[in-house]
């Protein structure tokens, strides 16, 4: 059994999150992950889900009935989802860092975004002019 | 010329968003983009910038003065990134719109927070016996 | 002040083994990865093991796979590395080295070092 | 496996800059934090740059180390060179497997 099964039993607990009337309303995130077969798409998903669990953690760092149990499942996460690769969690943590009332921060995003925009489709890897010939008519065929 | 290029052109004198000193201190997303050439490991990036600009338009919603401009900056992003597949846009809007400080919500992500890890890595593809003796294979020989 | 000190080095004949340790003091032990660097004479650095901070993740470098074992005792802030089967090709210093960053439970740079300690496998 | 390759040796004179690059053989060499180590003479190795550029406490300003994503190398750059440079330097990072490799290190001298 992987490490994280016996501390998300013990989070259960400690939020009540095994009583019955907690499946009521459907799910958060499954059934969106459900919907999701591609990788790429998968990807964009659980970053969500990932940003919402350590923000979860976060709020409740300091309870010691718990630090081991969400330190462990962090872990985890680190391991499956970052592949235990710190840049890459260290990048994604910055990005989930940003405040977005920050007039600083506003102005560098709205600064970097045509160039943020320019990388967002997996065709952004095409020659440029090739690329906005395609955009202009996928976008006259919609 | 992609449409959204003007718009943001208007959306940077709003935001005095081409002055010099906007530059200082280095980027928020683009030295991050750089740093990762993998499609999956881009939309785990990805996912988190764009929830941060769909943030920063809601904050701006009722200004009339670039309405415009958000509106076709954020229906270039849905052809872009969500690949004009507003299922795809809605599932992650929702992942975006869960409140973390709400105990209901809270719950709920803890109760399924097994099942979601277990989804994490790609290797949540092969049947769940073989995949669980992969990750203690993993964790026993590294 | 973060001190290493390992001890265990000498010489052993070709097939034989060694344990080597490594004392730690001036640090939380159990919050940091740790891990064994070699050096053959008048060669260049070579990860050979890590483990992570609890002990519960544990990684080898091809070379000494199935040969070698690392582990630790956080009650005694000690790193062992136990060698078996030990072949010409491991002759070297064994240096044990911190995790330059807590929290993490794989090492991704190494400081401090401590002084080494030399392995001659040698008939 | 990548590898890491760096020049053997390089030499320069006193209060000159000296560049030593690290080239990753494969996969991209942001895509995992670069560390650079000085050896010298007797020494065990000491950290100079971690995390591609950040310098440890009582490393001095002269050493600064850089990723050039085009060339798919890491640099370390070595300002105001002194003759206490002298050694031999490693660059090192971590495959995203639970490797971690080094480079085959580049003496520097230092002339004079």
């Known amino acids: 059994q992987d490490p994280y099964v016996k501390e998300a039993e013990n989070l259960k607990k400690y939020f009540n999150a095994g009583d019955p009337d907690v499946a009521d309303n459907g799910t958060l995130f499954l059934d969106i992950l459900r919907n999701w077969k591609e990788e790429s798409d998968r990807k964009i998903m659980q970053s969500q889900i990932v940003s919402f669990y350590f923000k979860l953690f976060k709020n409740f760092k300091d309870d010691q009935r718990i630090q081991k149990s969400v330190e462990t499942i962090k872990e985890d996460i680190n391991v499956k989802f970052f592949n235990s690769n710190k840049k890459k969690r260290d990048d994604f943590e910055k990005l989930t860092n940003y405040s977005v009332t920050d007039s600083n921060v506003q102005r560098k995003a709205v600064h970097e975004l045509i160039q943020v925009m320019a990388e967002l489709s997996p065709a952004a890897k095409i020659g440029k002019r090739k690329r906005s010939q395609m955009f202009r008519g996928r976008r006259a065929s919609q | 010329q992609d449409p959204y290029v003007k718009e943001a052109e208007n959306l940077k004198k709003y935001f005095n968003a081409g002055d010099p000193d906007v530059a200082d201190n280095g980027t928020l997303f683009l030295d991050i983009l750089r740093n990762w050439k993998e499609e999956s490991d881009r939309k785990i990036m990805q996912s988190q910038i764009v929830s941060f600009y769909f943030k920063l338009f809601k904050n701006f919603k009722d200004d009339q003065r670039i309405q415009k401009s958000v509106e076709t900056i954020k229906e270039d992003i849905n052809v872009k990134f969500f690949n004009s597949n507003k299922k795809k846009r809605d599932d992650f809007e929702k992942l975006t719109n869960y409140s973390v400080t709400d105990s209901n919500v809270q719950r709920k992500a803890v109760h399924e927070l097994i099942q979601v890890m277990a989804e994490l890595s790609p290797a949540a593809k092969i049947g769940k016996r073989k995949r669980s003796q992969m990750f203690r294979g993993r964790r026993a020989s590294q | 002040e973060v001190q290493l000190l390992e001890s265990g080095g000498g010489l052993v004949q070709p097939g034989g083994s060694l344990r080597l340790s490594c004392a730690a003091s001036?640090?939380?032990?159990?919050?940091?990865?740790m891990s064994w660097v070699r050096q053959a004479p008048g060669k260049g650095l070579e990860w050979v093991s890590a483990?992570?901070?609890?002990?519960?993740?544990?990684y080898y470098a091809d070379s000494v796979k199935g040969r070698f074992t690392i582990s630790r005792d956080n009650s005694k802030n000690t790193l062992y590395l136990q060698m078996n089967s030990l072949r010409a090709e491991d002759t070297a210093v064994y240096y044990c080295?911190?995790?330059?960053?807590?929290?993490?439970?794989?090492?991704?740079?190494?400081?401090?070092w401590g002084q080494g300690t030399l392995v001659t496998v040698s008939s | 496996n990548f590898m890491l390759t760096q020049p053997h040796s390089v030499s320069e004179s006193p209060g000159k800059t000296v560049t030593i690059s690290c080239t990753r053989s494969?996969?991209?060499?942001?895509?995992?934090?670069v560390q650079w180590y000085q050896q010298r003479p007797g020494s065990s190795p000491t950290t100079v740059i971690y995390?591609?550029?950040?310098?440890p406490s009582g490393v001095p300003d002269r050493f600064s180390g850089s990723i050039d994503s085009s060339s798919n190398s890491a640099s370390l750059t070595i300002s105001g060179l002194k003759t206490e440079d002298e050694a031999d330097y490693y660059c090192?990072?971590?495959?995203?497997?639970?490797?971690?490799?080094f480079g085959g290190g580049t003496k520097l001298t230092v002339l004079g």
């Open positions: 080295a911190k995790d330059g960053s807590s929290g993490w439970y794989v090492p991704h740079w190494f400081d401090p």
């Open positions: 001036g640090f939380t032990f159990s919050s940091y990865a």
């Open positions: 483990i992570s901070g609890s002990g519960g993740s544990t």
């Open positions: 494969s996969g991209s060499i942001a895509s995992n934090y």
């Open positions: 995390e591609d550029n950040q310098r």
């Open positions: 090192q990072s971590y495959d995203g497997s639970n490797r971690w490799m």
